[in-house]
């Protein structure tokens, strides 16, 4: 904490200008008011303060706005905002998407994943929901950052928004949050021909139930193998060798690459290996001819 | 051949929280989506929601503060936990399975349980 | 929320004639309704899909037709086992929504 000082009467301040990069930390703290520094916020980031400037600067804010900053100043942090912690951004309330926009901008390039992740968080909350206009800023500005939601959070985004979602976006999404993804797209997407729905649902297909994997098996649509390797473990298990061979198509032959990777290697597993030696790639450790297949599972539902 | 079947008190008292359970057999429950709909007596029906077996749901926003549906992969079952009923809550609660085929395209139900009468009275 | 409004509530038709029921949707639904069957004490049973899609196993008298806000269901010559409530549902969004019910009685 900065020690409490009086300030000198010629330091005194009545506006925030290029002269306070000469106050020592000590004299910012004692001269800068913080109702003045909020309400000149939007000056503060033309200004080239040192980092521990703006900790004083910060520190100024905080105690002003003890329960989270208003929008009024948030809008104008600038490089300011790097000084912020998830914990102070959890405190506020954004609304704007051009205050969305200007924090993007500013966190590029620094090692803010954190901090935007619950920035955009606090900005869904804001908003009531992941509209469209929220999902558009966040692809433009930040690419990869709709991942960074949580599951709960993308479920506000109306079905209606899917298709304004890229491929790229959801590279760095995992299962919990294709799970929520995936049924909206399969809305969103229903109307559409095969191929043209294909290759719409394709980067949904990570959160795709068995069914609708084995149904997209008899649609011609020769899935390739990074597709297929990001399908979950439980709705490739079930499927036929069959089932798959139709599914790739083409990129059949991919399997053999991946043999030892999940999920390929549990499907092979589960397979019988004359059915694996149908597909002529040499696929190992399938089940031995004339082994019986009990499926506990299913019996234990029954029971 | 997959079955469903709702279990669960068939009394609860006002303000209190409806608690049911469907089983479904004969099949897993990571293959499709789960939903549960209802039926007041002499009415129509009403979508509650849906869940998937990783524990991911869509609810009816009508009734979305008060619902909450959950899974157990391990017993084959989903649940469905409605808080804070009133009389306007009687009705036959149903599970049922969405179609899950993308060569159809829809959320619609082909398979449904055989019902539940849940009345909600003092 | 979409909602589904049939006609009539109630329809009184003769074993072996035509029975048409209508389903009108507040706003476009394209081609996402499904209708149903249910029998006194029985769950649903689902009919159609896709507005115009027998599912497996229903009889070819049973018909749809319509895309956008209004649907058919048709039944070309009623059996004894056709007098029930028919209901459609929308899927065209979030929430899925049901129509009230038409009750088909013998005449």
């Known amino acids: 904490d900065v020690e409490r000082t009086t300030c000198p009467p010629e330091k005194e301040v009545h506006e925030i200008d290029e002269s306070l990069i000469f106050y020592k930390k000590r004299e910012l703290e004692a001269c800068v008011d913080a109702a003045l520094l909020a309400a000149q916020m939007d000056r503060v980031d033309a200004i080239p303060f040192t980092y521990e400037q703006l900790d004083v600067l910060k520190h100024k804010l905080d105690e002003l706005y003890p329960q989270g900053y208003p929008e009024s100043v948030i809008r104008h942090l600038g490089h300011l905002f790097l000084k912020m912690s998830p914990e102070d951004i959890r405190k506020w309330n954004v609304t704007s998407l051009e205050t969305l926009k200007a924090l993007l901008k500013v966190s590029k390039g620094h090692e803010m994943s954190a901090q935007v992740a619950t920035l955009i968080d606090r900005v869904v909350v804001g908003r009531g929901q992941l509209d469209k206009d929220t999902v558009d800023t966040l692809t433009a500005f930040c690419p990869g950052c709709l991942c960074s939601l949580s599951p709960e959070r993308l479920s506000s985004v109306p079905p209606s928004v899917i298709g304004a979602v890229r491929p790229q976006d959801l590279d760095t999404c995992g299962p919990r949050q294709l799970d929520v993804l995936y049924p909206k797209a399969r809305l969103a997407f229903q109307n559409m021909s095969g191929s043209e729905y294909f290759v719409k649902i394709r980067p949904f297909l990570g959160g795709a139930p068995t069914e609708d994997v084995k149904a997209l098996s008899q649609q011609n649509v020769s899935m390739d193998l990074a597709t297929f390797m990001k399908l979950r473990r439980e709705a490739v298990l079930p499927l036929t060798v069959a089932e798959v061979q139709k599914l790739l198509g083409p990129h059949v032959e991919g399997l053999k690459v991946e043999e030892q990777h999940s999920p390929v290697r549990d499907w092979i597993l589960k397979q019988r290996q004359d059915d694996l030696d149908t597909l002529g790639l040499g696929l190992q450790g399938g089940i031995p001819n004339g082994y019986l297949i009990l499926d506990l599972s299913v019996r234990e539902a029954l029971s | 051949q997959v079955q469903l079947q709702e279990s669960g008190p068939g009394l609860v008292k006002p303000s209190e929280t409806l608690s049911l359970t469907c089983t479904v057999s004969?099949?897993?429950?990571?293959?499709?989506?789960w939903s549960w709909v209802r039926q007041p007596p002499g009415k129509g029906l009403e979508w509650i929601g849906y869940?998937?077996?990783?524990?991911?749901?869509q609810s009816n926003p009508s009734l979305k503060s008060r619902v909450i549906i959950s899974v157990d992969t391990s017993k084959n079952q989903f649940s469905l936990k409605l808080s804070s009923v009133t009389a306007a809550d009687t009705a036959v609660y149903y599970c049922?399975?969405?179609?899950?085929?993308?060569?159809?395209?829809?959320?619609?139900?082909?398979?449904w349980g055989r019902g539940t009468l849940v009345t909600v009275s003092s | 929320e979409i909602v589904m409004t049939q006609s009539p509530a109630t329809l009184s038709v003769s074993p072996g004639e035509r029975a048409t029921l209508s389903c009108r949707a507040s706003q476009s639904v394209q081609s996402n309704l499904a209708w149903y069957q249910q029998k006194p004490g029985q769950a649903p049973r689902l009919l159609i899909y896709g507005a115009s899609t027998r599912a497996t196993g229903i009889p070819a008298r049973f018909s749809g037709s319509g895309s956008g806000t209004e649907f058919t269901l048709t039944i070309s010559s009623l059996q004894s086992e056709d007098f029930a409530v028919y209901y459609c549902?929308?899927?065209?969004?979030?929430?899925?929504?049901f129509g009230q019910g038409t009750r088909l009685e013998i005449k």
């Open positions: 869940i998937f077996y990783s524990g991911s749901t």
């Open positions: 049922a399975r969405e179609v899950g085929r993308i060569a159809v395209a829809g959320w619609f139900f082909d398979l």
């Open positions: 004969g099949g897993s429950i990571q293959n499709y989506y």
């Open positions: 549902q929308q899927y065209n969004n979030w929430p899925l929504t």
